[in-house]
Interface confidence: low
């Protein structure tokens, strides 16, 4: 008996073989099948040659099918949609010869580390390409050259450290570009060309505000209505533009579009003068002082294991007056979670005054697996004198563009209605073993460092602030089962946490990278500020104020 459901909807024969425990293609598929669902089956490997008789096949869904290998060795002349997301593919074969009609390719949440230059050759009808949540560090410069009709490109939550110049050349139809949650520090001059790009997502990258960022800063100013903060399950066109979501990681966390680079040399190449001459703009930078933003720590016995594809973690960027903690909007911390998520980014060491080292060089050779430090970690004991900000240190004023207590995910989902698979990430990326930070002298006394010379930084306080990252606040007791949720303002993807204004006495749970577990975006409760304002979890007595 044929175990799959056959239906005819919108004039097409649709066969649903999802979650049937299939290890191979079932016999008896209708020859005029147009839509074939094979998701959530332990297929392991798949060859399109098996589908040769299905000459009318228009959609093939292989999501979460434990695929380690995809062979595109059989011609499927009418296939328009191929979904191989949430699998274990380490590479993609060349697709164009066998799938000439492909319009949508979803290879999100695989283990792709690189793409060959010819992967998309022949896919002249491709409209949507989803590569979110892989491990891509670089991209072939001409990867998209064959896909002139591309409309949506999702490269979010990879490990991209750079973008090739001319990468978007010829993509006149492109309307949505997801680049959030990568390791990008700048974009090449002219990268966006004259594309309109109505929907662009650039937040959650360690944008380095120096002279090289001026092109992006100007582009953001010119396209401020086209830059969005991505929200789980919300279509791009339904969200509100938020150009402030793109922030400098090294310069007081200000929005990139406000960065003027007054000390930068004028552009020498005359061709770009009119676009990149920033000296003709006299507007003053907005003040960089902001009210303290409350970080809410709540407790729950909910210890269900989540898989995460959320953003990266940058516990510190080593500026004495402004530790930059890049935390996704909501973190769950639990002893049970000892692995970094696969998208975990580089951790800039506190001993480096300038985070100029490319993140890719910061990968460990071993993986931390236990939350217990083997040596006494640097701690901020609640019994010690609270570290208070120096009066000469102006608090930052990053006005939240939306209600700050609403957590916002930082990655888009190509499949917002379906839960993510519970696969365990396998390649954590901390720079050093995060559970055993070494104190400079004694564990209880954070040691200052010298102030790096950075023109943009204000005069440092007379008493230098400790450079110990907030990720090493150690407990006096180890948590056993409760989950701690730290909810941070959406308005600041990169959070500057120079010091605690009062010690956290209510919770002594650690924020230790080996314990950090980032829940799937769709699993986060989407409470509005109104509905959560009076919620017990937002009680100010629960935690500390963190000046941002």
């Amino acid at each position: 008996e044929f175990i799959c459901e056959v239906s005819k909807v919108t004039s097409q024969v649709e066969v649903n073989c999802d979650n049937k425990g299939l290890k191979a293609l079932p016999p008896g598929l209708p020859g005029d099948t147009a839509i074939l669902h094979l998701a959530e089956n332990p297929l392991g490997a798949f060859s399109t040659a098996l589908l040769g008789p299905l000459t009318r096949l228009a959609q093939l869904h292989l999501r979460q099918s434990q695929l380690t290998q995809l062979q595109v060795d059989g011609m499927l002349p009418r296939l328009e949609t191929l979904d191989v997301s949430h699998n274990r593919l380490k590479s993609l074969p060349s697709l164009g010869r066998a799938l000439p009609a492909l319009t949508t390719l979803d290879a999100s949440f695989n283990e792709l580390v690189a793409l060959s230059p010819g992967t998309l050759d022949g896919l002249s009808h491709l409209h949507e390409l989803y590569l979110r949540g892989n491990k891509l560090k670089t991209l072939p410069p001409r990867l998209l050259a064959p896909t002139a009709q591309l409309r949506k490109l999702n490269l979010a939550d990879n490990r991209l450290t750079e973008l090739p110049p001319g990468f978007l050349e010829g993509l006149g139809e492109l309307d949505t570009l997801y680049l959030q949650g990568n390791w990008l520090r700048t974009v090449p001059k002219g990268f966006f060309g004259d594309l309109l790009l109505p929907f662009t997502f650039l937040h959650g990258n360690p944008w380095s505000c120096d002279c090289e960022i001026l092109y992006l800063a100007r582009w953001l100013r010119d396209n401020s209505n086209n830059v969005y903060l991505w929200k789980e399950g919300v279509e791009a066109k339904a969200t509100t533009p938020n150009v402030d979501s793109v922030r400098c990681v090294n310069w007081k966390n200000v929005p990139v579009h406000t960065y003027q680079g007054k000390d930068c040399p004028s552009p020498m190449d005359g061709g770009d003068m009119d676009y990149d001459n920033y000296d003709d703009e006299d507007e003053k930078l907005p003040g960089v002082e902001a009210p303290a933003t409350r970080a809410v720590v709540s407790f729950s016995t909910h210890t269900k294991a989540h898989t995460t594809h959320w953003g990266l973690l940058y516990p510190t960027f080593a500026y004495p007056d402004h530790q930059m903690a890049y935390l996704s909007s909501t973190l769950e911390l639990t002893e049970k979670q000892t692995m970094f998520p696969s998208t975990l980014g580089p951790i800039m060491p506190t001993t480096t005054p300038e985070p100029t080292t490319p993140p890719t060089t910061l990968e460990p050779t071993t993986t931390p697996t236990t939350p217990e430090p083997t040596t006494p970690p640097t701690t901020l004991e609640p019994t010690t004198t609270p570290i208070t900000p120096e009066p000469t240190m102006p608090p930052t004023t990053l006005e939240p563009t939306t209600t700050p207590i609403t957590p916002e995910p930082t990655t888009p989902s190509t499949t917002p209605t379906t839960p993510q698979p519970a696969t365990t990430p396998t390649t954590p990326q901390p720079a050093t073993t995060p559970t055993t930070p070494q104190p400079a002298t004694t564990p209880t006394t954070p040691q200052p460092t010298t102030t790096p010379t950075i023109p943009e930084l204000p005069t440092p306080p007379t008493t230098p602030e400790p450079t110990m990252p907030p990720t090493t606040l150690e407990p006096t007791t180890t948590p056993t089962s409760p989950t701690t949720t730290l909810i941070l303002s959406e308005s600041n993807t990169f959070l500057g946490i120079p010091e605690l204004t009062s010690p956290c006495t209510t919770s002594e749970y650690p924020i230790v990278p080996s314990l950090v577990h980032l829940p799937e975006a769709h699993e986060v409760a989407r409470g509005t500020s109104d509905s959560s304002r009076n919620h017990r979890l937002f009680n100010p007595d629960l935690c500390c104020l963190l000046p941002l």
């Epitope: 056959v6 005819k8 909807v9 919108t10 004039s11 097409q12 024969v13 598929l29 209708p30 020859g31 005029d32 099948t33 147009a34 000459t55 009318r56």
Partner: antibody, heavy 118, light 113 residues
Framework: QVQLVESGGGLVKPGGSLRLSCAAS????????MSWIRQAPGKGLEWVSS???????YYPDSVLGRFTISRDNAKNSLYLQMNSLRAEDTAVYYC????????????WGQGTLVTVSS | DIQMTQSPSSLSASVGDRVTITCKSS????????????LAWYQQKPGKAPKLLIY???TRESGVPSRFSGSGSGTDFTLTISSLQPEDFATYYC?????????FGQGTKVEIK
């Protein structure tokens, strides 16, 4: 050229049965979905049944459980087995070829009349 | 089921006239995935089988004269004969091929004035 020729119509009493046939030629029969559409005297068109190239049948509620569509690709033939016939089944029955899986009908036979009357 | 309603049920026209027949569906026939409207038009002459004229709202079947055109989207559709010819006097049916069961309009009879 594409040709569809229906046969098997006639007069039958209510509750009786009839089997219609459609002989197809001029195209690769096995590659196409096929359908039966009927037209009561002086009335409009009503879809009766379809069968995909792989043999999956489809029916409207009005004939479900009474009519059975089948095909024999080796004989290039389409069939409609009609049981428990009612007076309202009286109509000219057309055999038609469905275009792809889009279910509009690009070629029709000349029709065969089925009369259900006591 | 999707109901199809044609209007008028009959009309009289002369050779050379521009004739418009409308068809309304009880729900949208637009497939948002490919932006196509799943509506077809047929012509039937007395004693003959129907003949396909147009599918996907506006795509003419091969061999169909260009004076026949279709338009519309969602739930409202139109068949237009730009210049009526003697051989065009017949009954015209719309059919939705969006969702099973496939349903037809009741027909519009175009007669000689």
């Amino acid at each position: 050229q594409v040709q569809l020729v229906e046969s098997g119509g006639g007069l039958v009493k209510p509750g009786g049965s009839l089997r219609l046939s459609c002989a197809a030629s001029g195209f690769t029969f096995s590659s196409f979905a096929m359908s039966w559409i009927r037209q009561a005297p002086g009335k409009g068109l009503e879809w009766v049944s379809s069968i995909t190239s792989a043999g999956t049948p489809y029916y409207p509620d009005s004939v479900l459980g009474r009519f059975t569509i089948s095909r024999d690709n080796a004989k290039n033939s389409l069939y409609l087995q009609m049981n428990s016939l009612r007076a309202e089944d009286t109509a000219v029955y057309y055999c038609a070829r469905s275009r792809g899986y889009e279910d509009y009908f690009d070629y029709w036979g000349q029709g065969t009349l089925v009369t259900v009357s006591s | 089921d999707i109901q199809m309603t044609q209007s008028p049920s009959s009309l009289s026209a002369s050779v050379g006239d521009r004739v418009t027949i409308t068809c309304k569906s009880s729900q949208s026939l637009l497939n948002s995935r490919n932006q196509k409207n799943y509506l077809a038009w047929y012509q039937q002459k007395p004693g003959k089988a129907p003949k396909l004229l147009i599918y996907f709202t506006s795509t003419r079947e091969s061999g169909v004269p260009s004076r026949f055109s279709g338009s519309g989207s969602g739930t409202d559709f139109t068949l237009t004969i730009s210049s009526l010819q003697p051989e065009d006097f017949a009954t015209y049916y719309c059919q939705q091929h969006y969702s099973s069961p496939w349903t037809f309009g009741q027909g519009t009879k175009v007669e000689i004035k």
